[in-house]
Interface confidence: medium
């Protein structure tokens, strides 16, 4: 279970933490979930690592951040931002968002109470 919630840092502190952690395993894990065995997604070799391994790595990375509503939200927004251009249509965007919303629970963290995933200036 995630460590006890700490003092919520200011947003620049969260940004620094989000920059420091490796969000790639989270992005890969979600892409694996929404793409399944489809082969058209070649930005990563998504079949090289089992999804459960990627999920664990993702959770480990997120666990490095301060355990606050704001920092968790900023990490999820950054994942959305990073993958936005790779999401081919509106349906894929919605699937990605749904999987992203599930991520805190999959990692046994609390979901942020407020977190807007409509980032990237409306592109996603």
């Amino acid at each position: 279970m995630r460590r006890e919630r700490g003092r919520q840092g200011d947003s620049s502190s969260c940004e620094r933490q989000v920059d420091r952690v490796n969000l790639k395993p989270c992005e890969q894990h979600i892409m694996q979930r929404i793409m399944g065995e489809q082969e058209q997604y070649d930005s990563y070799d998504i079949r090289s690592t089992r999804s459960s391994d990627q999920q664990q790595r993702c959770c480990d990375e997120l666990n490095e951040m301060e355990n606050t509503q704001r920092c968790m939200c900023e990490a999820l927004q950054q994942i959305m931002e990073n993958q936005c251009d790779r999401l081919q249509d509106r349906q894929m965007v919605q699937q990605f968002k749904r999987e992203l919303m599930n991520l805190p629970q999959q990692c046994n963290f609390r979901a942020p109470q407020r977190c807007d995933l409509d980032v990237s200036g409306g592109r996603c």
Epitope: Q8, R98, A111
Partner: antibody
Framework: QVQLQEAGPRLVKPSQTLSVTCTVS??????????WSWIRQHPGKGLEWMGY???????YYNPSLKSRIAMSIDTSKNQFSLKLTSVTAADTAIYFC?????????WGQGTLITVSS | DIQMTQSPSSLSASVGDRVTITCQAN??????LNWFQHKPGTAPKVLIY???KLETGVPSRFSGSGSGTHFTFTISGLQPEDFATYFC?????????FGQGTKLEIR
């Protein structure tokens, strides 16, 4: 537009089990990311947050109720439920269901359940 | 559990008045605070979230401020439809906890 509606017996006898169900319309309860919660308000008093159930069945209960409370989810009916065992007059309250996390918290209008013999 | 102390418990005011309600937490909750409006027989409605952000569609006469342990909710220019019960809720820690509520009545 998402709506929540509580339903349960108006009257429960002391020592029995109180059961209340929340029907969700306008959205699937299986969509991840949301906490489906229960809150109650004792007559003339403040609100007590009882706990939540997540779409995968994981629960968190208020420690003050942990020994008596159980929540469940029925995806086929798009409902979630609360059971409270060994009730006393102190459990007389308006019971609200709610959806929390990610965006505006949404509440039902509440249902009054009286514990009396 | 985090204790939320809300005051006053009741308040009489007239249309056009400015009213202020406070909520105090017994430990730091940063800005993880909702302000709700509740009218009997209806679903409670969030007006302010994250202590100071106005919920979509809520009139600008409602405002919130504060962080840490001390929070304030203000209605500037009361309207007839504003007479209701208002309460705060912290969501920084589980279990979430509420203030006791403030009943706003017509003077």
């Amino acid at each position: 537009q998402v709506q929540l509606q509580e339903a349960g017996p108006r009257l429960v006898k002391p020592s029995q089990t109180l059961s209340v169900t929340c029907t969700v319309s306008g959205a699937s309860i299986t969509i991840g990311g949301y906490y489906w919660s229960w809150i109650r308000q004792h007559p003339g008093k403040g609100l007590e947050w009882m706990g939540y159930i997540y779409s995968n069945g994981r629960t968190y209960y208020n420690p003050s109720l942990k020994s008596r409370i159980a929540m469940s989810i029925d995806t086929s009916k798009n409902q979630f439920s609360l059971k409270l065992t060994s009730v006393t007059a102190a459990d007389t309250a308006i019971y609200f269901c709610a959806r929390e996390a990610w965006e505006t918290p949404l509440w039902g209008q509440g249902t009054l359940i009286t514990v009396s013999s | 559990d985090i204790q939320m102390t809300q005051s006053p418990s009741s308040l009489s005011a007239s249309v056009g008045d400015r009213v202020t309600i406070t909520c105090q937490a017994n430990q730091d909750i940063v800005n993880s605070l909702n302000w709700f409006q509740h009218k009997p027989g209806t679903a409670p409605k969030v007006l302010i979230y994250d202590a100071s952000k106005l919920e979509t569609g809520v009139p600008s006469r409602f405002s919130g401020s504060g962080s840490g342990t001390h929070f304030t909710f203000t209605i500037s220019g009361l309207q007839p439809e504003d007479f209701a019960t208002y309460f705060c809720q912290q969501y920084e820690n589980l279990p979430h906890t509420f203030g006791q509520g403030t009943k706003l009545e017509i003077r």
